[in-house]
Protein backbone atom coordinates (compact mmCIF):
# COMPACT_ATOMS: atom_id res chain seq x y z
CA UNK A 1 0.00 0.00 0.00
CA UNK A 2 1.53 3.26 -1.13
CA UNK A 3 0.21 6.57 0.09
CA UNK A 4 0.87 9.84 -1.71
CA UNK A 5 0.25 13.07 0.16
CA UNK A 6 -1.65 15.38 -2.13
CA UNK A 7 -1.09 19.02 -1.35
CA UNK A 8 -3.90 21.47 -1.77
CA UNK A 9 -2.15 24.61 -2.93
CA UNK A 10 -3.09 27.62 -0.87
CA UNK A 11 -2.37 30.25 -3.47
CA UNK A 12 -2.83 33.45 -1.55
CA UNK A 13 -1.24 35.79 -4.07
CA UNK A 14 -4.19 36.33 -6.33
CA UNK A 15 -7.02 34.51 -8.00
CA UNK A 16 -5.86 34.88 -11.58
CA UNK A 17 -6.07 31.75 -13.68
CA UNK A 18 -2.49 30.83 -14.53
CA UNK A 19 -1.39 30.40 -18.09
CA UNK A 20 -0.41 26.89 -19.13
CA UNK A 21 3.09 25.92 -17.98
CA UNK A 22 3.76 24.04 -21.22
CA UNK A 23 6.18 26.63 -22.59
CA UNK A 24 8.39 26.64 -19.50
CA UNK A 25 10.49 24.23 -17.53
CA UNK A 26 8.62 22.94 -14.51
CA UNK A 27 8.50 19.77 -12.49
CA UNK A 28 5.61 18.35 -10.55
CA UNK A 29 6.24 15.97 -7.65
CA UNK A 30 4.10 15.24 -4.59
CA UNK A 31 5.54 16.37 -1.27
CA UNK A 32 5.52 12.87 0.14
CA UNK A 33 5.03 9.20 -0.71
CA UNK A 34 4.58 6.63 2.07
CA UNK A 35 5.13 2.89 1.88
CA UNK A 36 6.02 -0.01 4.18
CA UNK A 37 9.46 -1.57 4.40
CA UNK A 38 9.67 -4.58 2.11
CA UNK A 39 7.09 -3.16 -0.28
CA UNK A 40 7.64 -1.09 -3.41
CA UNK A 41 6.92 2.61 -3.82
CA UNK A 42 6.38 4.84 -6.83
CA UNK A 43 7.93 8.31 -6.82
CA UNK A 44 5.91 10.37 -9.30
CA UNK A 45 7.64 13.09 -11.32
CA UNK A 46 6.36 14.81 -14.43
CA UNK A 47 7.76 17.83 -16.20
CA UNK A 48 7.08 20.41 -18.87
CA UNK A 49 9.70 22.08 -21.04
CA UNK A 50 9.96 24.85 -23.62
CA UNK A 51 11.52 22.76 -26.41
CA UNK A 52 8.50 21.76 -28.44
CA UNK A 53 8.74 18.29 -30.04
CA UNK A 54 12.24 17.71 -28.66
CA UNK A 55 13.41 14.38 -30.01
CA UNK A 56 17.13 14.47 -29.23
CA UNK A 57 19.19 12.53 -26.71
CA UNK A 58 18.03 12.79 -23.11
CA UNK A 59 19.10 11.55 -19.70
CA UNK A 60 16.80 10.95 -16.76
CA UNK A 61 18.38 11.08 -13.31
CA UNK A 62 17.18 10.56 -9.77
CA UNK A 63 19.36 11.55 -6.85
CA UNK A 64 18.93 11.15 -3.11
CA UNK A 65 19.53 13.36 -0.12
CA UNK A 66 19.94 16.78 -1.68
CA UNK A 67 19.18 18.48 -4.97
CA UNK A 68 21.87 19.16 -7.57
CA UNK A 69 24.65 17.50 -5.54
CA UNK A 70 23.25 14.38 -3.88
CA UNK A 71 24.37 10.89 -5.00
CA UNK A 72 22.62 9.45 -8.03
CA UNK A 73 20.50 6.37 -7.37
CA UNK A 74 19.18 5.99 -10.91
CA UNK A 75 20.17 7.15 -14.37
CA UNK A 76 19.02 6.19 -17.83
CA UNK A 77 19.69 7.55 -21.31
CA UNK A 78 17.52 7.62 -24.41
CA UNK A 79 19.06 8.01 -27.86
CA UNK A 80 17.72 10.44 -30.43
CA UNK A 81 14.22 9.40 -31.47
CA UNK A 82 14.12 6.49 -29.04
CA UNK A 83 11.38 5.95 -26.46
CA UNK A 84 13.56 3.44 -24.63
CA UNK A 85 15.54 4.89 -21.74
CA UNK A 86 18.46 2.53 -21.26
CA UNK A 87 19.33 2.12 -17.58
CA UNK A 88 22.92 3.11 -16.84
CA UNK A 89 22.65 3.13 -13.03
CA UNK A 90 20.21 1.51 -10.62
CA UNK A 91 21.57 1.45 -7.09
CA UNK A 92 21.46 -2.16 -5.79
CA UNK A 93 19.21 -2.91 -8.77
CA UNK A 94 16.17 -1.65 -6.87
CA UNK A 95 15.28 1.42 -8.94
CA UNK A 96 13.30 1.21 -12.16
CA UNK A 97 11.85 3.91 -14.40
CA UNK A 98 8.08 3.60 -14.71
CA UNK A 99 7.46 6.73 -16.72
CA UNK A 100 8.41 7.56 -20.28
CA UNK A 101 10.74 10.59 -20.37
CA UNK A 102 9.68 11.25 -23.98
CA UNK A 103 6.22 11.81 -22.60
CA UNK A 104 7.48 14.07 -19.83
CA UNK A 105 7.26 11.41 -17.14
CA UNK A 106 10.23 10.45 -14.96
CA UNK A 107 8.28 8.44 -12.36
CA UNK A 108 10.45 5.91 -10.55
CA UNK A 109 9.66 2.61 -8.82
CA UNK A 110 11.72 1.62 -5.80
CA UNK A 111 11.65 -2.09 -4.92
CA UNK A 112 12.19 -3.83 -1.57
CA UNK A 113 12.08 -0.74 0.57
CA UNK A 114 14.24 -0.51 3.67
CA UNK A 115 14.23 2.08 6.44
CA UNK A 116 17.47 3.45 5.00
CA UNK A 117 15.50 4.51 1.91
CA UNK A 118 13.57 7.04 3.99
CA UNK A 119 14.88 10.30 2.51
CA UNK A 120 14.24 12.85 -0.21
CA UNK A 121 14.58 12.07 -3.88
CA UNK A 122 15.07 14.55 -6.70
CA UNK A 123 14.27 13.95 -10.36
CA UNK A 124 16.25 15.59 -13.15
CA UNK A 125 16.12 15.56 -16.92
CA UNK A 126 18.91 16.62 -19.27
CA UNK A 127 18.59 17.34 -22.97
CA UNK A 128 21.71 17.03 -25.14
CA UNK A 129 21.97 17.45 -28.86
CA UNK A 130 20.79 20.49 -30.78
CA UNK A 131 19.33 21.68 -27.49
CA UNK A 132 21.41 21.69 -24.32
CA UNK A 133 19.16 22.16 -21.33
CA UNK A 134 18.36 20.54 -17.99
CA UNK A 135 16.02 20.87 -15.06
CA UNK A 136 15.81 19.35 -11.60
CA UNK A 137 13.11 19.30 -8.96
CA UNK A 138 14.19 21.58 -6.17
CA UNK A 139 12.26 20.36 -3.16
CA UNK A 140 11.98 16.78 -4.28
CA UNK A 141 9.67 14.09 -2.97
CA UNK A 142 10.05 12.70 0.51
CA UNK A 143 9.86 8.92 0.66
CA UNK A 144 8.50 8.00 4.07
CA UNK A 145 9.20 4.36 4.86
CA UNK A 146 7.24 2.79 7.70
CA UNK A 147 8.19 -0.45 9.42
CA UNK A 148 7.00 -2.70 12.22
CA UNK A 149 9.45 -2.91 15.12
CA UNK A 150 12.44 -5.20 14.96
CA UNK A 151 14.78 -5.74 17.88
CA UNK A 152 18.25 -5.47 16.44
CA UNK A 153 20.25 -6.05 19.62
CA UNK A 154 19.63 -7.20 23.17
CA UNK A 155 22.49 -7.80 25.59
CA UNK A 156 23.61 -7.94 29.18
CA UNK A 157 26.70 -5.95 30.05
CA UNK A 158 28.75 -5.68 33.21
CA UNK A 159 28.53 -2.44 35.10
CA UNK A 160 30.52 -1.15 38.12
CA UNK A 161 30.39 -2.91 41.49
CA UNK A 162 29.77 -6.38 40.07
CA UNK A 163 26.35 -5.39 38.80
CA UNK A 164 24.83 -5.94 35.38
CA UNK A 165 22.74 -3.86 33.02
CA UNK A 166 20.67 -4.80 30.01
CA UNK A 167 20.44 -2.93 26.71
CA UNK A 168 17.77 -3.30 24.07
CA UNK A 169 17.93 -1.58 20.67
CA UNK A 170 15.05 -1.71 18.23
CA UNK A 171 14.25 -0.12 14.90
CA UNK A 172 10.95 0.86 13.35
CA UNK A 173 8.98 3.73 11.95
CA UNK A 174 7.23 5.26 13.78
CA UNK A 175 10.07 4.76 16.30
CA UNK A 176 8.88 2.03 18.66
CA UNK A 177 8.18 2.39 22.36
CA UNK A 178 10.34 0.02 24.37
CA UNK A 179 9.43 -1.73 27.61
CA UNK A 180 11.30 -4.17 29.83
CA UNK A 181 9.78 -6.91 31.94
CA UNK A 182 11.50 -9.41 34.19
CA UNK A 183 12.12 -10.63 37.73
CA UNK A 184 11.09 -8.09 40.36
CA UNK A 185 10.37 -5.52 37.67
CA UNK A 186 6.64 -5.95 37.70
CA UNK A 187 4.84 -6.30 34.43
CA UNK A 188 6.23 -4.36 31.45
CA UNK A 189 8.29 -1.68 33.09
CA UNK A 190 8.42 1.21 30.65
CA UNK A 191 11.91 2.35 29.75
CA UNK A 192 13.01 5.75 28.54
CA UNK A 193 13.15 5.99 24.78
CA UNK A 194 16.37 7.39 23.42
CA UNK A 195 16.63 7.64 19.63
CA UNK A 196 20.31 7.47 18.80
CA UNK A 197 21.99 10.44 17.18
CA UNK A 198 22.06 10.05 13.42
CA UNK A 199 19.94 6.90 13.55
CA UNK A 200 16.40 8.29 13.56
CA UNK A 201 14.73 4.88 13.39
CA UNK A 202 16.77 3.25 16.19
CA UNK A 203 15.63 3.40 19.79
CA UNK A 204 17.58 2.10 22.79
CA UNK A 205 16.31 1.34 26.28
CA UNK A 206 18.54 0.46 29.21
CA UNK A 207 17.74 -1.49 32.33
CA UNK A 208 20.45 -0.08 34.59
CA UNK A 209 20.58 -2.65 37.40
CA UNK A 210 19.63 -6.31 37.10
CA UNK A 211 19.11 -7.40 40.68
CA UNK A 212 17.72 -10.90 40.14
CA UNK A 213 18.64 -13.84 37.98
CA UNK A 214 16.15 -14.88 35.35
CA UNK A 215 14.61 -13.89 32.05
CA UNK A 216 14.40 -10.24 31.01
CA UNK A 217 12.18 -9.43 28.04
CA UNK A 218 12.29 -6.33 25.88
CA UNK A 219 9.13 -5.47 23.97
CA UNK A 220 9.12 -2.99 21.09
CA UNK A 221 5.80 -1.71 19.79
CA UNK A 222 4.52 0.83 17.31
CA UNK A 223 1.32 1.30 15.32
CA UNK A 224 2.39 -1.39 12.85
CA UNK A 225 3.19 -4.19 15.28
CA UNK A 226 5.31 -5.45 18.12
CA UNK A 227 8.42 -7.52 18.66
CA UNK A 228 9.91 -9.26 21.68
CA UNK A 229 13.32 -10.60 22.60
CA UNK A 230 14.67 -11.98 25.85
CA UNK A 231 17.97 -12.24 27.59
CA UNK A 232 18.79 -14.51 30.53
CA UNK A 233 20.94 -13.61 33.52
CA UNK A 234 22.53 -16.41 35.56
CA UNK A 235 25.14 -15.38 38.08
CA UNK A 236 27.53 -18.05 39.30
CA UNK A 237 31.00 -17.43 40.78
CA UNK A 238 30.73 -13.73 39.84
CA UNK A 239 30.22 -14.43 36.16
CA UNK A 240 27.18 -14.08 33.96
CA UNK A 241 25.86 -16.17 31.14
CA UNK A 242 23.48 -14.52 28.74
CA UNK A 243 21.64 -15.87 25.76
CA UNK A 244 18.82 -14.66 23.57
Amino acid sequence: FVRTKIDTTENLLNTEVHSSPAQRWSMQVPPEVSAEAGDAAVLPCTFTHPHRHYDGPLTAIWRAGEPYAGPQVFRCAAARGSELCQTALSLHGRFRLLGNPRRNDLSLRVERLALADDRRYFCRVEFAGDVHDRYESRHGVRLHVTAAPRIVNISVLPSPAHAFRALCTAEGEPPPALAWSGPALGNSLAAVRSPREGHGHLVTAELPALTHDGRYTCTAANSLGRSEASVYLFRFHGASGAST
Epitope: E10, W25, Q28, P31
Partner: antibody
Framework: EVQLQQSGTELVRPGSSVKISCKAS????????MDWVKQRPGQGLEWIGE????????NYNQKFKGKATLTVDKFSRTAYMELSSLTSEDSAVYYC?????????????????WGQGTLVTVSA | ENVLTQSPAIMSASPGEKVTISCSAS?????MYWYQQKPGSSPKPWIY???NLASGVPARFSGSGSGTSYSLTISSMEAEDAATYYC?????????FGAGTKLELK
Amino acid sequence: EVQLQQSGTELVRPGSSVKISCKASGYTFTRYWMDWVKQRPGQGLEWIGEIDPSDSYTNYNQKFKGKATLTVDKFSRTAYMELSSLTSEDSAVYYCARSGAYSSDYSYDGFAYWGQGTLVTVSA
Amino acid sequence: ENVLTQSPAIMSASPGEKVTISCSASSSVSYMYWYQQKPGSSPKPWIYRTSNLASGVPARFSGSGSGTSYSLTISSMEAEDAATYYCQQWSSNPLTFGAGTKLELK
Protein backbone atom coordinates in the same frame (compact mmCIF):
# COMPACT_ATOMS: atom_id res chain seq x y z
CA GLU B 1 -4.56 36.34 7.77
CA VAL B 2 -1.03 35.07 7.24
CA GLN B 3 1.54 36.65 9.56
CA LEU B 4 5.23 36.10 10.22
CA GLN B 5 6.27 37.74 13.47
CA GLN B 6 10.02 38.02 14.01
CA SER B 7 11.95 38.54 17.24
CA GLY B 8 13.39 41.93 18.12
CA THR B 9 16.65 43.75 17.46
CA GLU B 10 19.85 42.06 18.64
CA LEU B 11 23.12 43.71 19.61
CA VAL B 12 25.79 41.04 19.89
CA ARG B 13 29.54 40.72 20.38
CA PRO B 14 31.93 39.49 17.68
CA GLY B 15 32.54 35.76 17.93
CA SER B 16 29.26 35.07 19.67
CA SER B 17 26.06 33.50 18.35
CA VAL B 18 22.50 34.72 18.01
CA LYS B 19 19.23 32.90 17.46
CA ILE B 20 16.35 34.76 15.90
CA SER B 21 12.79 33.53 15.62
CA CYS B 22 9.87 33.79 13.23
CA LYS B 23 6.43 32.83 14.53
CA ALA B 24 3.91 31.90 11.85
CA SER B 25 0.14 32.21 12.05
CA GLY B 26 -2.85 32.13 9.74
CA TYR B 27 -1.92 29.08 7.65
CA THR B 28 -0.91 25.43 7.90
CA PHE B 29 2.66 25.77 9.14
CA THR B 30 3.90 22.41 7.86
CA ARG B 31 2.63 22.94 4.31
CA TYR B 32 4.98 25.71 3.30
CA TRP B 33 8.75 26.01 3.34
CA MET B 34 10.25 28.84 5.32
CA ASP B 35 13.13 30.78 3.82
CA TRP B 36 15.57 33.25 5.33
CA VAL B 37 16.99 36.28 3.55
CA LYS B 38 19.79 38.65 4.55
CA GLN B 39 19.94 42.35 3.74
CA ARG B 40 22.97 44.39 4.75
CA PRO B 41 22.40 48.13 5.31
CA GLY B 42 21.83 49.83 1.97
CA GLN B 43 22.43 46.57 0.11
CA GLY B 44 20.41 44.00 -1.79
CA LEU B 45 18.83 40.72 -0.77
CA GLU B 46 20.75 37.51 -0.25
CA TRP B 47 19.15 34.09 0.18
CA ILE B 48 20.43 32.10 3.16
CA GLY B 49 18.45 28.90 2.96
CA GLU B 50 15.11 27.22 3.50
CA ILE B 51 13.53 24.63 5.75
CA ASP B 52 10.54 22.34 5.33
CA PRO B 53 8.69 22.47 8.67
CA SER B 54 7.07 19.09 8.04
CA ASP B 55 10.33 17.19 8.52
CA SER B 56 12.99 19.86 9.17
CA TYR B 57 14.72 19.15 5.86
CA THR B 58 17.03 22.06 5.00
CA ASN B 59 18.54 23.44 1.83
CA TYR B 60 21.27 26.06 2.32
CA ASN B 61 23.04 28.53 0.13
CA GLN B 62 26.58 27.09 0.21
CA LYS B 63 27.86 30.51 1.26
CA PHE B 64 25.94 30.26 4.55
CA LYS B 65 26.67 26.65 5.42
CA GLY B 66 28.39 26.67 8.79
CA LYS B 67 27.22 30.22 9.44
CA ALA B 68 23.46 29.73 9.65
CA THR B 69 21.51 26.85 11.16
CA LEU B 70 17.79 26.62 10.44
CA THR B 71 15.39 24.80 12.74
CA VAL B 72 11.65 24.73 13.43
CA ASP B 73 9.37 23.95 16.33
CA LYS B 74 6.19 22.58 14.80
CA PHE B 75 4.23 22.83 18.01
CA SER B 76 4.82 26.53 18.54
CA ARG B 77 4.74 27.12 14.75
CA THR B 78 8.07 28.92 14.97
CA ALA B 79 11.07 28.90 12.67
CA TYR B 80 14.52 29.75 14.00
CA MET B 81 17.81 30.80 12.50
CA GLU B 82 21.00 30.65 14.54
CA LEU B 83 24.03 32.60 13.31
CA SER B 84 27.40 31.61 14.73
CA SER B 85 30.91 33.09 14.95
CA LEU B 86 29.53 36.54 14.28
CA THR B 87 31.58 39.27 12.62
CA SER B 88 30.74 42.76 11.41
CA GLU B 89 29.88 41.20 8.02
CA ASP B 90 26.90 39.56 9.69
CA SER B 91 25.40 42.90 10.73
CA ALA B 92 22.20 43.02 8.70
CA VAL B 93 18.44 42.77 8.70
CA TYR B 94 17.34 39.15 8.48
CA TYR B 95 13.93 38.27 7.08
CA CYS B 96 11.94 35.10 7.23
CA ALA B 97 9.76 34.63 4.19
CA ARG B 98 7.16 32.05 3.41
CA SER B 99 7.75 30.16 0.23
CA GLY B 100 4.92 29.34 -2.12
CA ALA B 101 3.24 25.97 -2.38
CA TYR B 102 4.84 22.93 -0.87
CA SER B 103 6.73 21.02 -3.48
CA SER B 104 5.90 21.25 -7.16
CA ASP B 105 8.13 23.76 -8.89
CA TYR B 106 5.27 25.04 -11.00
CA SER B 107 3.15 25.94 -8.01
CA TYR B 108 5.91 28.01 -6.43
CA ASP B 109 4.69 31.58 -6.14
CA GLY B 110 7.78 33.29 -4.83
CA PHE B 111 7.88 34.71 -1.33
CA ALA B 112 4.27 35.58 -0.74
CA TYR B 113 4.74 36.68 2.87
CA TRP B 114 7.64 38.27 4.73
CA GLY B 115 8.39 38.91 8.38
CA GLN B 116 9.07 42.47 9.49
CA GLY B 117 12.79 41.74 9.74
CA THR B 118 15.20 41.38 12.66
CA LEU B 119 18.14 43.77 12.85
CA VAL B 120 21.32 42.09 14.07
CA THR B 121 24.20 44.42 14.92
CA VAL B 122 27.59 42.89 15.65
CA SER B 123 29.75 45.26 17.63
CA ALA B 124 32.41 45.13 20.29
CA GLU C 1 25.35 30.27 -9.20
CA ASN C 2 22.90 32.00 -11.52
CA VAL C 3 23.79 35.69 -11.41
CA LEU C 4 20.93 38.13 -12.02
CA THR C 5 22.00 41.50 -13.43
CA GLN C 6 19.49 44.32 -13.12
CA SER C 7 19.59 47.44 -15.19
CA PRO C 8 19.60 50.25 -14.63
CA ALA C 9 20.84 50.30 -11.03
CA ILE C 10 19.18 53.67 -10.44
CA MET C 11 16.68 55.55 -12.56
CA SER C 12 14.22 58.37 -12.23
CA ALA C 13 10.91 58.79 -14.02
CA SER C 14 8.29 61.48 -14.23
CA PRO C 15 4.66 60.82 -13.43
CA GLY C 16 2.93 59.29 -16.47
CA GLU C 17 6.19 58.06 -17.97
CA LYS C 18 6.65 54.44 -19.07
CA VAL C 19 9.31 52.58 -17.08
CA THR C 20 11.09 49.34 -17.92
CA ILE C 21 13.44 47.52 -15.56
CA SER C 22 15.48 44.66 -16.97
CA CYS C 23 16.83 41.53 -15.32
CA SER C 24 19.33 39.37 -17.16
CA ALA C 25 20.25 35.88 -15.90
CA SER C 26 23.63 34.26 -16.46
CA SER C 27 21.82 31.01 -17.29
CA SER C 28 18.29 30.22 -18.37
CA VAL C 29 15.50 30.32 -15.78
CA SER C 30 11.91 29.12 -15.97
CA TYR C 31 10.23 32.02 -14.22
CA MET C 32 11.22 35.33 -12.76
CA TYR C 33 9.83 36.84 -9.57
CA TRP C 34 9.83 40.52 -8.65
CA TYR C 35 9.63 42.29 -5.29
CA GLN C 36 9.11 45.91 -4.34
CA GLN C 37 10.83 47.36 -1.29
CA LYS C 38 10.52 50.79 0.26
CA PRO C 39 12.94 52.14 2.89
CA GLY C 40 12.36 50.70 6.34
CA SER C 41 9.94 48.06 5.10
CA SER C 42 10.09 44.40 4.18
CA PRO C 43 10.07 43.44 0.50
CA LYS C 44 6.61 42.85 -0.96
CA PRO C 45 5.74 40.23 -3.59
CA TRP C 46 5.06 42.13 -6.80
CA ILE C 47 5.15 39.83 -9.79
CA TYR C 48 5.34 36.05 -9.66
CA ARG C 49 5.96 33.46 -12.35
CA THR C 50 7.17 36.14 -14.75
CA SER C 51 3.86 37.83 -15.51
CA ASN C 52 1.32 37.33 -12.69
CA LEU C 53 0.62 40.33 -10.48
CA ALA C 54 0.55 39.75 -6.75
CA SER C 55 -2.56 40.72 -4.84
CA GLY C 56 -3.05 44.48 -4.65
CA VAL C 57 -0.50 45.36 -7.33
CA PRO C 58 -1.87 48.00 -9.72
CA ALA C 59 -2.65 46.90 -13.27
CA ARG C 60 -0.17 49.44 -14.68
CA PHE C 61 2.56 46.93 -13.75
CA SER C 62 3.39 44.03 -16.01
CA GLY C 63 6.12 41.44 -16.31
CA SER C 64 7.46 39.51 -19.26
CA GLY C 65 10.42 37.54 -20.52
CA SER C 66 11.83 34.06 -20.98
CA GLY C 67 15.16 32.27 -20.98
CA THR C 68 17.74 34.70 -19.65
CA SER C 69 15.96 37.99 -20.32
CA TYR C 70 13.12 39.35 -18.19
CA SER C 71 11.59 42.74 -17.49
CA LEU C 72 9.18 44.61 -15.28
CA THR C 73 7.23 47.45 -16.90
CA ILE C 74 5.18 50.30 -15.47
CA SER C 75 2.91 51.70 -18.19
CA SER C 76 2.48 55.04 -16.44
CA MET C 77 4.69 56.01 -13.51
CA GLU C 78 2.99 57.20 -10.32
CA ALA C 79 4.52 58.67 -7.17
CA GLU C 80 3.77 55.57 -5.08
CA ASP C 81 5.83 53.44 -7.49
CA ALA C 82 9.09 55.00 -6.28
CA ALA C 83 10.88 52.11 -4.60
CA THR C 84 13.60 49.53 -5.15
CA TYR C 85 12.65 46.53 -7.28
CA TYR C 86 14.40 43.17 -7.05
CA CYS C 87 14.20 40.24 -9.43
CA GLN C 88 14.65 36.68 -8.15
CA GLN C 89 15.04 33.25 -9.72
CA TRP C 90 14.22 29.84 -8.27
CA SER C 91 15.28 27.53 -11.08
CA SER C 92 18.69 26.60 -9.73
CA ASN C 93 20.61 26.49 -6.48
CA PRO C 94 21.21 28.78 -4.80
CA LEU C 95 18.14 30.93 -5.17
CA THR C 96 19.44 34.37 -6.23
CA PHE C 97 18.25 37.97 -6.31
CA GLY C 98 19.28 40.79 -8.57
CA ALA C 99 21.12 43.70 -6.96
CA GLY C 100 18.02 45.86 -7.25
CA THR C 101 16.88 48.83 -9.30
CA LYS C 102 16.12 52.00 -7.39
CA LEU C 103 13.29 53.86 -9.08
CA GLU C 104 12.96 57.50 -8.10
CA LEU C 105 10.29 60.04 -8.91
CA LYS C 106 11.55 62.87 -11.11
